[in-house]
């Protein structure tokens, strides 16, 4: 199809090599008086959609994206060309950065119901640099954290740097939605609930003398609680001894609680005691079982191909450590009898 | 530096219509949002609205309707269209440049409209 | 419909005075935070004194600061300047931004 009459906006995704990102575009299709399709639920350009910025068809995903070649060959479907980029609803996701996304993405509605509809798509020119070590030395973090039931705020990475009376208008989007009435650098939240979680991205323009682009950054906002005071605990075993049978095989499973921590290492391990000598076991790799904003539940299992007369005059422990300490549960093993 | 100066404000007969005018300087109407907000003599402040970047406008309940705000990018211009001018009109209007919703972070010094027959 | 009310309209202040401004709102300010606090001096423009309800603006004087949330909120100034005397607004931001607007003023003179 002709790309000719496409609305075309620029975009620009500066990146920062320390770390991973991700980045979106939206098929913002046009405000227009033009095409059914594109209506927006009827909202006259002067007002604002709540919901999406994408209006444009009652089915979201019944949109298609390409890219365009630099080199003037056909466009290319994105789903089947692009497996780095992923398609949900009418957002485009990249989930790497690099300079080979530079590009041209075009989006248009599938379903072409009349010879107006053609018209209605929109070009997004897309430029992907990697950040400049001139640039601000501690820009915002593209994962941020809020901490559950106190104040916090999201920051803009790209426009971290600058105060809040310089920083030009910023338009937010939360997961898609526009937040219409937060227009600056920073989302200052007044009490964090787990709603405030999600992907965030911030958008504003930059100008100069030839034409004006917007620059994008994406945000991952997780909620957390504060990090644990405690050490964890062992949820099991819980006694002392276990009553094995003499050349069956075994497997004792420790089960430890870690509180939440913000730098989570969790350290989850068996070790033997015979005598006076100790030795860590090679065994299964740990498992979270249960996860939840306040703690994860670990698991580690040792396991023995048969049990032996040896290893009832042995201990069998279980050491567990968080930032806080550690702690220890050792077993007995002990045969049954009759 | 950031400056920003009101002009177009005269005595006019209730009834008409009249457009402010607030050039900008040392900043782009394309990266900032813009506001409008009068004082009758003697009175306080109210908040008439606000023009985003994009364009997008929103006005105080009292102002839709009669009152429109504009913008000229390339002109560095913003525009406030008043029309069926009443005598309660009669105020210094002001532009801000507005971050956020709120705050009016730098004002124009003002231009002052009297609407009287 | 939105009622923004300042107390008290006027206050007689001395230099060295600390001097406590009220605002409330209702409904609730968007996000609980979204207050501002103006300075108006006459033949001039308004001034941004504090925004999000207690940041203090660029090259604001410490004496000045504002505390609360949601509908209560506080404009304080510890220790009266002769500069001080002025009127204040207190300025809310809500979710239908076509709602946003101003306190009634308070006027603080000279006693």
């Known amino acids: 199809f002709n790309i000719s009459g496409c609305s075309t906006k620029k975009l620009l995704w500066t990146y920062s090599t320390r770390s991973e990102e991700e980045f979106v575009l939206f098929c913002d299709l046009p405000e227009p008086q033009k095409s059914h399709f594109c209506h927006r639920n009827r909202l006259s350009p002067k007002q604002v959609p709540e919901h999406l910025p994408f209006m444009g068809s009652n089915d979201l995903s019944d949109v298609q994206w390409y890219q365009q070649p630099s080199n003037g060959d056909p466009l290319e479907d994105i789903r089947k060309s692009y497996p780095h980029i992923i398609q949900d609803k009418c957002t485009l996701h990249f989930l790497t950065p690099g300079v080979n996304n530079s590009g041209s993405y075009i989006c248009r509605p599938k379903m072409i119901k009349s010879p107006y509809d053609v018209a209605c798509c929109v070009k997004m020119i897309l430029e992907v640099k990697p950040q400049t070590n001139a640039s601000c030395e501690y820009s915002a973090s593209h994962k941020q954290d809020l901490l559950l039931g106190s104040t916090g705020s999201i920051s803009c990475p790209s426009l971290s740097c600058q105060s809040d009376a310089q920083s030009p208008a910023v338009t937010w989007y939360k997961n898609g939605k526009l937040l219409s009435v937060e227009r600056s650098n920073r989302i200052v939240v007044d009490e964090v609930y787990d709603y405030h979680q999600g992907t965030y991205v911030c958008d504003y323009t930059q100008s100069d003398t030839v034409s004006s682009w917007t620059v994008r950054a994406v945000v991952q906002v997780r909620t957390i609680v504060g990090d644990t005071k405690l050490k964890p605990d062992i949820l099991d075993p819980v006694e002392d001894t276990l009553e094995v049978e003499l050349g069956k095989p075994l497997t004792i499973s420790c089960k430890a609680r870690f509180g939440f921590e913000r730098v989570f290492n969790p350290v989850i391990k068996w070790y033997i005691k015979d005598s006076d000598l100790e030795w860590e076991v090679s065994v299964p790799e740990a498992k979270s079982i249960k996860s939840t904003l306040k703690d994860e539940i670990i698991e580690r299992n040792i396991i023995l191909e048969k049990v032996t007369q040896r290893d009832l005059r042995r201990k069998f422990v279980c050491f567990v450590q968080n930032s806080i300490g550690n702690t220890t549960q050792s077993v007995q093993l002990k045969e049954k009898r009759g | 530096e950031v400056q920003l100066e009101e002009s177009g404000g005269r005595l006019v007969q209730p009834g008409t219509s009249l457009r402010l005018s607030c050039a900008v300087s040392?900043?782009?109407?394309?990266?900032?949002?813009m506001s409008w907000v009068r004082q009758a003599p003697g009175k306080g402040l109210e908040y008439v609205g606000i023009?985003?970047?994009?364009?997008?406008?929103y006005y105080a309940n009292w102002a839709k309707g009669r009152f429109t705000i504009s913008k000229d990018t390339s002109k560095t211009t913003l525009y406030l269209q008043m029309n069926s001018l009443r005598a309660e009109d009669t105020a210094t209007y002001f532009c801000?440049?507005?971050?956020?919703?709120?705050?009016?972070?730098?004002w124009g010094q003002g231009t002052l409209v009297t609407v009287s027959s | 419909d939105i009622v923004m009310t300042q107390s008290p309209s006027s206050l007689s202040a001395s230099v060295g005075d600390r001097v406590t401004i009220t605002c409330q709102s209702s409904?609730?300010?968007?996000?609980?935070?979204?207050l501002s606090w103006f300075q108006q001096k006459p033949g001039q423009a308004p001034k941004l004194l504090i925004y999000?309800?207690?940041t203090l603006a660029s090259g604001v004087p410490s004496r000045f600061s504002g505390s609360g949330s949601g509908t209560d909120f506080t404009l304080t100034i510890s220790s009266l300047q002769p500069e001080d005397f002025a009127t204040y607004y207190c300025?809310?931001?809500?979710?239908?931004?076509?709602?946003?607007?101003f306190g009634q003023g308070t006027k603080v003179v000279i006693k």
């Open positions: 801000a440049r507005t971050h956020n919703t709120l705050p009016f972070y730098i």
């Open positions: 040392g900043f782009s109407l394309n990266s900032y949002d």
């Open positions: 023009i985003y970047n994009s364009g997008t406008t």
């Open positions: 409904p609730s300010v968007y996000n609980n935070n979204r």
């Open positions: 999000y309800a207690s």
């Open positions: 300025a809310g931001g809500y979710s239908s931004i076509s709602d946003n607007g």
